[in-house]
Interface confidence: low
């Protein structure tokens, strides 16, 4: 039986050129986390596997930083990074938890000005 | 059910080459971890290299930057290139597979997951 929830940082807003840290944590379970993947719609951002460490995809190589912990960096944002991205967590023995977050990159007078979008 | 089977092993000197292949029939082309490991008489089996089912590798200390490993593009046949081979590389050599989450390689260990029967590499000097 699954009993483990994955908090994330919800929808989020992050200022076009900055950068902004996805975060997803797995609680309530006692599953051994073996793999955490991040994705944005259908792409493959990276992969931190517990035996075999870190591998970013080629081609966000440049703007991809794994981390803080099992955490990913995103690095000079463009307006195309809006979307959502998804935190998958392979666990042993309990399966996949999946977590979704929603990011919008917004230009800097928008950001500025504190829009932010209401979690629901 | 999942087979493997090794081969390519032999007889070589020091300093020589040579490829092992494991042909694996009922693995799933996704989540499994693939990898190499070999016993020498009177030690422990010990594991030489893994990739996982997204190619991420890991390899022994002993055996970096001498040894490489790979899977075709239909992941049906795992490799291992052995290069530069040392007399203490000699050992039977084993093929295994464990269908851990994600292609997880850490559960993979003798007494779990998928084995071949091996194939001997003997290095002399």
């Known amino acids: 039986m699954m009993t483990g929830t994955i908090e994330t940082t919800g929808n989020i807003s992050a200022e076009k050129g900055g950068s902004i840290i996805l975060q997803c944590h797995l609680s309530s379970t006692t599953a051994q986390v073996t793999q955490v993947n991040w994705e944005q719609q259908d792409q493959l951002l990276a992969i931190c596997n517990a035996d075999l460490g870190w591998h970013i995809s080629p081609s966000f190589k440049d703007r991809v930083a794994p981390g803080p912990g099992l955490g990913l960096t995103l690095q000079s944002l463009t307006v195309n990074d809006t979307g959502e991205y998804f935190c998958i967590y392979h666990t042993y023995p309990d399966g996949t938890y999946t977590g979704r977050i929603f990011l919008e990159v917004l230009e800097s007078s928008v950001a500025e000005h504190g829009a932010r979008f209401q979690i629901p | 059910q999942v087979q493997l089977a090794e081969s390519g092993g032999g007889s070589v000197q020091t300093g020589g080459s040579l490829r092992l292949s494991c042909e694996a029939s009922g693995v799933a082309a996704s989540g499994y971890c693939m990898a190499w490991f070999r016993q020498a008489p009177g030690k422990e089996r010990e594991r030489v290299a893994a990739?996982?089912?997204?190619?991420?590798?890991a390899y022994a200390d002993s055996v970096k930057g001498r040894f490489t490993i790979s899977k075709d593009n239909a992941k049906t046949t795992l490799y291992l290139q052995m290069n530069n081979l040392k007399p203490e590389d000699t050992a039977m050599y084993y093929c295994?597979?464990?269908?851990?989450?994600?292609?997880?390689?850490?559960?993979?260990?003798?007494?779990?997951?998928?084995w071949g029967q091996g194939t001997q590499v003997t290095v002399s000097s």
């Open positions: 990739i996982s089912s997204n190619d991420l590798v």
């Open positions: 295994a597979a464990d269908g851990g989450y994600g292609g997880y390689c850490g559960r993979l260990r003798p007494g779990t997951g998928y």
